[in-house]
């Protein structure tokens, strides 16, 4: 049932904060979708707590989550992908708290991969390319990507570029010469589906050429 439990046995449980957040990943394993939930308070005693999703499912009323250490997880084909589901934290048959969530609004894409940077000597620029599994998907195909790069010595001075394609050109003159750069990329749904940024791709490191003293241009590496 929706709302908070009122059973005397659960009085102690009711004092706890059972706030939780979830994200969905569509077609994460072939045609299977996943839903991952976790408590916002890491100190919640999860020993007897279960998660259940009801509604907006195909030919079943409810599904139970599997517990994987601190997170709760479902992998299934049975999401209707329209309308709101009721996700509840339960102790036995009693619901401690519930949230109505549309799974299409909490989509977290998979992280981009195969990030690489190629220097083009003639063009004096760097071509950044990466790949995403979403190009092959039926649902979450349209993504906005966030490419972030920084000089390795600048701990928190990231430059961000948003793009919808998987290719970006960085002009050599916008970068420091003879410097080591770190670059990474993440993605977020950008059409129909809504949600969260993916995890960052693994970082890629590249060095800019030195300046050629006679011409004032960088030397290729």
């Amino acid at each position: 049932e929706s709302g908070y439990a009122q059973n005397g046995d659960l009085e102690d449980a009711e004092l706890d904060d059972y706030s939780f957040s979830c994200y969905s990943q569509l077609e994460v394993n072939g045609s299977q979708h996943s839903l991952t939930c976790a408590f916002e308070d890491p100190d919640v005693n999860i020993t007897n707590l279960e998660f259940e999703i009801c509604g907006a499912l195909v030919e079943v009323k409810c599904l139970n989550f599997r517990k994987l250490q601190e997170i709760y997880f479902i992998e299934t084909k049975k999401f209707l992908l329209i309308g709101k589901s009721n996700i509840c934290v339960k102790v036995g048959e009693k619901s401690l708290t519930c949230k109505k969530i549309d799974l299409t609004t909490i989509v977290k894409p998979e992280a981009p991969f195969d990030l690489s940077v190629v220097y083009r000597e003639g063009a004096n620029d760097f071509v950044v390319t990466f790949n995403t599994s979403h190009l092959q998907k039926k649902y979450v195909k349209v993504l906005m990507h966030d490419v972030a790069y920084r000089q390795e010595k600048d701990e928190n001075k990231w430059t961000h570029v948003n793009l919808s394609s998987t290719k970006l050109t960085l002009l050599q003159r916008k970068l420091q010469p003879a410097a080591m750069y770190e670059i990474k990329v993440r993605s977020i749904p950008d059409h129909y589906f809504k949600g969260f940024w993916s995890e960052w791709s693994p970082s890629y490191y590249f060095r800019t050429p030195e300046i050629n003293n006679s011409s004032g241009e960088m030397d290729p590496i």
Epitope: E1, S2, C54, G55, A56, L57, V58, E59, V60, K61, C62, L80, L81, I82, G83, K84, N86, K100, D102, K138, Y139, Y192
Partner: antibody
Framework: QVQLVQSGAEVKKPGASVKVSCKAS????????MNWVRQAPGQGLEWMGL????????SYNQKFKGRVTLTRDTSISTAYMELSRLRSDDTAVYYC????????????WGQGTTVTVSS | EIVLTQSPATLSLSPGERATLSCSAS?????MHWYQQKPGQAPRPWIY???KLASGIPARFSGSGSGTDYTLTISSLEPEDFAVYYC????????FGGGTKVEIK
């Protein structure tokens, strides 16, 4: 205004199939489920199944699974319900109904299509 | 599958009287909806998610309940309220009750 307009009455013989259409207007067709509910003469309401028009995913009442097929054509905002292997007890009024995805109730209904199965 | 039992099957009352319609579920239901149907017409949404009135429904109607027992109440019957009312569970397979006919006494 939001409207669901269904195809006209049908008379079918036992063993035949019937296909009823439901044309939606006044809202984004792909944003709501389309449900099918039937009502036999003098009887109550019986949910048959639904389709998500965005992706074509269907969910059927087990009672009708294998006999009912729900489809849609998003280009003309129309949903279809086909019932095969008709029997005399399939004689009923068939309704399409839009599903409100926030609360899962049927907030807009078609006018109904009478299907008579008789030899 | 949940069975929804509506009682009474028929309720004979006069305009101005209070009507109480019951819907009992064979196991717990989180949300219940109600529809009104008049002869020869499609059902109309009446009350959704236990107690929320659908668009244009007058305030003399109210809904309540939890778990297995739900109620639709009409505080003072008007002539246009005489009809059949169906309850329905919110979740698959969206089962309807058998209906309660509210008729003029």
């Amino acid at each position: 205004q939001v409207q669901l307009v269904q195809s006209g009455a049908e008379v079918k013989k036992p063993g035949a199939s019937v296909k009823v259409s439901c044309k939606a207007s006044g809202y984004t067709f792909t944003g709501y489920t389309m449900n099918w509910v039937r009502q036999a003469p003098g009887q109550g309401l019986e949910w048959m199944g639904l389709i998500n028009p965005y992706n074509g995913v269907t969910s059927y009442n087990q009672k009708f699974k294998g006999r009912v097929t729900l489809t849609r054509d998003t280009s003309i905002s129309t949903a279809y319900m086909e019932l095969s292997r008709l029997r005399s007890d399939d004689t009923a009024v068939y309704y399409c109904a839009r599903g409100d995805g926030n609360y899962w109730y049927f907030d807009v209904w078609g006018q109904g299509t009478t299907v008579t199965v008789s030899s | 599958e949940i069975v929804l039992t509506q009682s009474p099957a028929t309720l004979s009352l006069s305009p101005g009287e209070r009507a109480t319609l019951s819907c009992s579920a064979s196991s717990s239901v989180t949300y219940m909806h109600w529809y009104q149907q008049k002869p020869g017409q499609a059902p109309r949404p009446w009350i959704y998610e236990i107690s929320k009135l659908a668009s244009g429904i007058p305030a003399r109607f109210s809904g309540s309940g939890s778990g297995t027992d739900y109620t639709l109440t009409i505080s003072s019957l008007e002539p246009e309220d005489f009809a059949v009312y169906y309850c329905q569970e919110w979740n698959y397979p969206y089962t309807f009750g058998g209906g309660t006919k509210v008729e003029i006494k």
